[in-house]
């Protein structure tokens, strides 16, 4: 749809075009499967426009339908370790809080590869916090062209 001249002068956030692209900061301590993310111009090609980070987890600030995407490359990996030497390594993206809205949105397995990538459209609400859980013992790459996570507001 066409935007009025007044709308064109508004910041993107006010139009509802919330968007974020994050890079991996670190993995969690023992017994914490979550990946911790970071974003901002000083870090390179990551940014937050609307959504915010809460202790490394992405929190939504505007209701709407979002495109959620993620890619994770395992730095320490093996063509056989994902199935034979170690517990199966899986990546799950979900709403982890508030507890009343807790649900898995994406689940992927590193069967015999060292990179997974996926995306989906899903409704998200203000206050939803997205967690990315990497289970298994293999370590993810922190390289920004190999591991990244983001959301893009698509429509109300």
């Amino acid at each position: 749809q066409r935007l009025s001249r007044a709308q064109q002068q508004l910041p993107l956030e006010s139009l509802g075009w919330d968007i974020a692209e994050l890079q991996l900061n670190h993995t969690g301590p023992q017994q914490d499967p979550r990946l911790y993310w970071q974003g901002g111009p000083a870090l390179g090609r990551s940014f937050l426009r609307g959504p915010e980070l809460d202790k490394g987890q992405l929190r939504i600030r505007r209701d709407g339908i979002y495109m959620v995407h993620i890619q994770v490359t395992l730095a320490i990996c093996s063509s056989t370790s994902t199935s034979r030497h170690h517990h199966p390594t899986t990546l799950a993206v979900g709403i982890c809080s508030p507890a009343s809205r807790s649900i898995s949105l994406l689940r992927l397995s590193f069967h015999q590869g060292c990179t997974i990538a996926s995306q989906r459209l899903t409704p998200l609400a203000r206050g939803d916090t997205l967690c990315t859980n990497l289970t298994g013992t293999l370590l993810p790459s922190r390289n920004t062209d190999e591991t990244f996570f983001g959301v893009q507001w698509v429509r109300p």
Epitope: T27, A75, I76, S79, H85, P140
Partner: antibody, heavy 120, light 108 residues
């Protein structure tokens, strides 16, 4: 300046045990994966074991699996290698090495090594 | 396990000459995750190259790496006296991490 200082090597009889330590300084120890790599006299380098920054993930070469245990104490900035049921073929200089920050298993800093001799 | 074979075993050259060292993998190395190290007698290895072609911090530009898949090369464009040492390649794309057995670059 990054520094890695190994200790704990020595002469031990076959079947015996030894615990190696690696004291780290000059960097935020807890965010780096760490490894032990060994080199038998006049021989090739051999990767032994790796541990993630948190200590939650460990990896071992088949030749030491079930006999060696890697661990770390992030509060003391120290890496350990507990070696049990030692064999003559474990004789080597043992190096402590730091992984690249991105978690990749190339080693950007190495200690000077500690010699382990297994002999009767 | 990926086996790395380095050749030649020994390279006899004079200062100022060009050194070309080869590392061949028994199977393709994931995303060119290959490193080169230099080791002098009684010392720990020193990282020279990672990712097959990226120079580590502080490494002079006379050292360069190339290759992908199964064939990798370390080139020293003009040998300096301090470059005479043993050079090892290592793959880190697949568990277990493996090293080649080295190429000794000695003074002719």
């Amino acid at each position: 300046e990054v520094q890695l200082l190994e200790s704990g090597g020595g002469l031990v009889q076959p079947g015996g045990s030894l615990r190696l330590s690696c004291a780290a300084s000059g960097f935020t120890f807890s965010v780096y994966a760490m490894s032990w790599v060994r080199q038998a006299p006049g021989k090739c380098l051999e990767w032994v074991s790796t541990i993630s920054g948190s200590g939650g993930s460990t990896f071992y070469a088949e030749s030491v699996k079930g006999r060696f245990t890697i661990s770390r104490d992030n509060s003391k900035n120290t890496l350990y290698l507990q070696m049990n049921r030692l064999r003559a073929e474990d004789t080597a200089v043992y190096y402590c090495a730091r992984h690249d920050y991105s978690n990749y298993a190339y080693f950007d800093y190495w200690g000077q090594g500690t010699l382990v001799t297994v002999s009767s | 396990e990926i086996v790395l074979t380095q050749s030649p075993g020994t390279l006899s050259l004079s200062p100022g000459e060009r050194a070309t060292l080869s590392c061949r993998a028994s199977q393709s190395v994931r995303s060119s995750y290959l490193a080169w190290y230099q080791q002098k007698p009684g010392q720990a290895p020193r990282l020279l190259i990672y990712g097959a072609s990226s120079r580590a911090t502080g490494i002079p530009d006379r050292f360069s790496g190339s290759g992908s898949g199964t064939d990798f090369t370390l080139t020293i464009s003009r040998l300096e006296p301090e470059d005479f040492a043993v050079y090892y390649c290592q793959q880190y794309g697949d568990l277990p991490f493996t090293f080649g057995c080295g190429t000794k670059v000695e003074i002719k």
